[in-house]
């Protein structure tokens, strides 16, 4: 008959190298950051420097022109979305350095990590708006002559921002701080508790609305635009194609790892080996997505130099030429004179 024997227990088999090991004191946890976390820190640092300076410059250049130039309104809003997201980076950087410890409280946990998702939705919706604008300029020039104005552009941007805020709410609501007992650590993350279905729903909506649907619609939209451009033998059509592909592709390339890991994690058990591996890559995927927040100014500069050969021009002057050139409504010219801004519509929304 089995019976309890608590008098001389053998603790030897109680072995857990990670945490809560009765034979491993509290201080014996690793102080080395994982390689994915180190890479994430490097990316965050670069994105912060380029993103804050670059987007601040874009905001400065476009803000003065936004009253009269519709393209400036688009670029101003994209830059504001990117700039806002970059402001969260020092906090996210600090958290990773501290092995994902979150000493900043519950409110910061809800708001700051949600900024990148707000950026994703704001950018993709703004990009869709810009793409619609491009489409109308090419296919409905008369309508544009009559109705395309700064007021309507601002309304479209406000709608995009409103929808982006609405779509970010689920992430915001489910973000919580969890204080772990051992080793002592406060974590900031999403917690759906019992509701795995809701977690999957949020991940699917994010994938569809923030990635797949925009990918499909923008591809179709630009296919039509480029086909019309080619058919009319518009000048610089090859360059236009290259810039469009670069701008749109960058959004989807940089968001792809985040979206793929996100959807996979929502369908996996939290204790499964695959889930744990993906969790270790989470910071890297977020940092990769954050590249979107600094890539727009780079694209604008490269596009400006490539199209106008203004290598020796000052940066603000170069950006002004790229970002504030107004589209001419006549179809043939709309792709000659505003090629750069068409392409530089950075699918940063991606």
């Amino acid at each position: 008959m089995d019976s309890f024997n608590y008098t001389t227990p053998d603790y030897g088999h109680y072995d857990d190298k990670d945490t809560l090991d009765l034979n491993t004191p509290v201080d014996k946890t690793s102080n080395t950051l994982r390689v994915p976390d180190i890479l994430a820190l490097v990316i965050f640092a670069v994105v912060f420097l380029v993103g804050v300076l670059g987007n601040a410059l874009v905001v400065w250049v476009t803000a003065f022109e936004a009253k009269r130039t519709i393209n400036a309104i688009w670029f101003l809003n994209l830059a504001v979305a990117d700039f806002l997201s970059c402001l969260a980076l020092p906090i996210l950087f600090t958290s990773i350095v501290q092995h994902h410890h979150w000493p900043f409280g519950g409110a910061a946990c809800s708001i700051l990590p949600s900024l990148i998702l707000l950026n994703m939705y704001a950018s993709i919706l703004l990009l869709a708006t810009i793409s619609a604008d491009r489409f109308l300029l090419v296919f409905k020039p008369i309508w544009c002559q009559n109705f395309r104005g700064a007021g309507l552009a601002w309304i479209a941007c406000a709608v995009a921002w409103g929808l982006a805020l609405l779509l970010t709410i689920p992430s915001f609501l489910y973000r919580v701080v969890r204080e772990e007992y051992f080793p002592p650590k406060v974590l900031c993350g999403v917690d759906y508790s019992h509701d795995k279905r809701r977690e999957r729903a949020v991940a699917i909506v994010r994938l569809v609305l923030g990635f797949l649907w925009p990918l499909l619609t923008l591809t179709i939209c630009y296919t039509f635009i480029l086909l019309r451009t080619w058919s009319r033998r518009a000048t610089r059509s090859t360059k236009t194609l290259k810039v469009v592909v670069a701008v749109v592709a960058s959004f989807f390339i940089f968001w792809l790892p985040y979206q793929v890991t996100g959807i996979m994690m929502s369908f996996l058990e939290p204790s499964s080996p695959t889930f744990l591996l993906l969790k270790k890559l989470d910071s890297l995927c977020v940092s990769f997505a954050y590249i979107n927040c600094c890539i727009n100014p780079i694209i604008y500069v490269v596009a400006g130099q490539g199209f106008q050969g203004r290598l020796r021009k000052s940066l603000p002057s170069l950006l002004r030429n790229v970002l504030t050139e107004e589209s001419v409504v006549r179809e043939s010219k709309s792709f000659t004179r505003s090629t750069v801004d068409t392409m530089a519509q950075k699918t940063q929304a991606v």
Epitope: L20, V26, E179, E180, F182, K279
Partner: antibody, heavy 116, light 111 residues
Framework: QVQLQQSGPELVKPGDSVKMSCKAS????????MDWVKQSHGKSLEWIGY????????RYNQRFKGRASLTVDKSSNTAYMELHSLTSEDSAVYYC?????????WGQGTLVTVSA | DVVMTQTPLSLPVSLGDQASISCRSS???????????LHWYLQKPGQSPKLLIY???NRFSGVPDRFSGSGSGTHFTLKLSRVEAEDLGIYFC?????????FGAGTKLEL
């Protein structure tokens, strides 16, 4: 062999304070949390908090914050818990337990009775 | 705080019977390390609680193999394959993943 020896029962008046001790032996005292748990008569267990002697780290359950004070004397490997402004609700058995993991080692408990 | 809901609160058994106790947590108990810190204790009258199962399914030293633990995330179960007289007492589930540590209300196993 790890042992946790707690101080004897206490009878105190409402509004008073009580300080109980838990002497540890058989392991390196500073290396592990010392946790405290309350068990009211016929009821479940309630975690009060822990003290980590290595860095004087303390964490309280919000329900006990301000009413419980955890301290240690590293020279004697003894942990202490003081309870303030006692009411009849505080009548219970209080256990110390070696933490940083599931509680394998528990003290025998200190019975505190609050009565006028 | 993580609420641990234990059922049933009382479990009358006969010696040799099977017994099963359920424990649900209001939040996931998966630690950032990937481990789940859900434990089971048995307390007999006048004694301190004693550890039976740690990390969901690991039997502690000296605990008979008629005890087994299972579950994941938020749903956990303790099973006794054949109840013996010395198994009687109050069983508590407990989580040590998150602060504050919390315990179930207890299940009294009685004849």
């Amino acid at each position: 062999q790890v042992q946790l020896q707690q101080s004897g029962p206490e009878l105190v008046k409402p509004g008073d304070s009580v300080k109980m001790s838990c002497k540890a032996s058989g392991y390196t005292f500073s290396d592990y949390y010392m946790d405290w748990v309350k068990q009211s008569h016929g009821k479940s267990l309630e975690w009060i908090g822990y003290f980590y002697p290595n860095n004087d780290g303390i964490r309280y359950n919000q329900r006990f914050k301000g009413r419980a004070s955890l301290t240690v004397d590293k020279s004697s490997n003894t942990a202490y818990m003081e309870l303030h402004s006692l009411t009849s609700e505080d009548s219970a058995v209080y256990y110390c337990a070696r933490g940083s993991g599931p509680f394998v080692y528990w003290g025998q408990g200190t019975l505190v009775t609050v009565s006028a | 705080d993580v609420v641990m809901t234990q059922t049933p609160l009382s479990l009358p058994v006969s010696l040799g019977d099977q017994a099963s106790i359920s424990c649900r947590s209001s939040q996931s108990l998966v630690h950032s390390s990937g481990n789940t810190y859900l434990h089971w204790y048995l307390q007999k009258p006048g004694q301190s609680p004693k550890l039976l199962i740690y990390k969901v399914s690991n039997r502690f030293s000296g605990v008979p193999d008629r005890f087994s633990g299972s579950g994941s995330g938020t749903h956990f179960t303790l099973k006794l394959s054949r109840v013996e007289a010395e198994d009687l007492g109050i069983y508590f589930c407990s989580q040590s993943t998150l602060i504050p540590l919390t315990f179930g209300a207890g299940t009294k196993l009685e004849l």
